[in-house]
Amino acid sequence: QSPPGKPEIHKCRSPDKETFTCWWNPGSDGGLPTNYSLTYSKEGEKNTYECPDYKTSGPNSCFFSKQYTSIWKIYIITVNATNEMGSSTSDPLYVDVTYIVEPEPPRNLTLEVKQLKDKKTYLWVKWLPPTITDVKTGWFTMEYEIRLKSEEADEWEIHFTGHQTQFKVFDLYPGQKYLVQTRCKPDHGYWSRWGQEKSIEIPNDFTLKD
């Protein structure tokens, strides 16, 4: 039996700059029941506070609802582990909510096979920004990637589309079924997870419908 090992704050992420969650890795418990508490202060302020919500985001996490989330403030976050034999504190993590955004994936992915005047066939991929994103006001600007592969292929082919919410994919094989997904990243944040997979079959005898 021994004091607990040093916990490590794994990551903090926000879906929208309005709320955020931090997760930690506990470290060893020293063979004893161990309690974990997350405390935080804001840079330039004296007060230290305890995590407002240990439940919403699951085990070893702290959820900061709107009420507890400030942008343009640096949070200094630590996790403390305590058992009968002693305690241990993580290294502090400095968090600026503006820089930890991991949005929801883009939505309304649509796939359409089209043809140019020269009869060249292409797949037109279109999507919309994630619901929470207020793109027009500049609160968020998103960059996007799409990935696609034929059902038989092992590797995805990735296309960066910048801020465009549509993309044309050329050189596809007729008769093949293709899977497509999109993801997005805000200016200062992280890529979202890949969104829901959509599929489409490229017709063998594609002719443009009027």
Epitope: V135, K136, G138, T141, M142, E143, E145, E157, I158, F160, T161, G162, H163, Q164, F167, K168, D187
Partner: antibody, heavy 120, light 107 residues
Framework: EVQLVQSGAEVKKPGASVKVSCKAS????????IHWVRQAPGQGLEWIGY????????GYNQKFKSRATLTVDNSTSTAYMELRSLRSDDTAVYYC?????????????WGQGTTVTVSS | DIQMTQSPSSLSASVGDRVTITCRAS??????LAWYQQKPGKPPKLLVY???TLAEGVPSRFSGSGSGTDFTLTISSLQPEDFATYYC?????????FGQGTKLEIK
Amino acid sequence: EVQLVQSGAEVKKPGASVKVSCKASGYTFTDYNIHWVRQAPGQGLEWIGYIYPNNDGTGYNQKFKSRATLTVDNSTSTAYMELRSLRSDDTAVYYCARGDGNYVGDMDYWGQGTTVTVSS
Amino acid sequence: DIQMTQSPSSLSASVGDRVTITCRASENIYSYLAWYQQKPGKPPKLLVYNAKTLAEGVPSRFSGSGSGTDFTLTISSLQPEDFATYYCQHHYATPFTFGQGTKLEIK
């Protein structure tokens, strides 16, 4: 005919700012990205950033992010690149270029270039 | 950031020669490579994008190939107007970066 016409040469002192304009014609301005690239005397090409006029989305080379601002005026189909806190090594020809309508990063039409000289 | 390395940095050749310029990316960029030609005092001109697609109005003596990390630009039969500096550029994801250039001179 697609054309990108840039503003004239500028001479600036160190620490000053410069704003270069790029007026587009011959295509739908909001459908294509506008890139900014610079070339120091006798040197290669260096990408500064791009803007998508459709939603004002921008992407920057980290090297310029704190000093460069890209904007557009859709009513006049004009893109702008402002560079602040100028240093002598910012002396270069600055180009605007249109991004291909599908692939973001390749540049199919270029402005004639604007020479910016930074000297005390 | 993805680094682009061109070789050679300069090259002397004669009219009618077949010339190859290579470009290597520091990581996989799939087929996201463009080639530009630049003459003194002029802006660059797009020759090839997506590694092998010729831009509009570019003569067929120019061709591009490669994918992943290794790419080439080939001029099958040099013409007097082809003497210029050539740049490769990846257009895979930001930041887009250029090679250092290859100056093609008359022998």
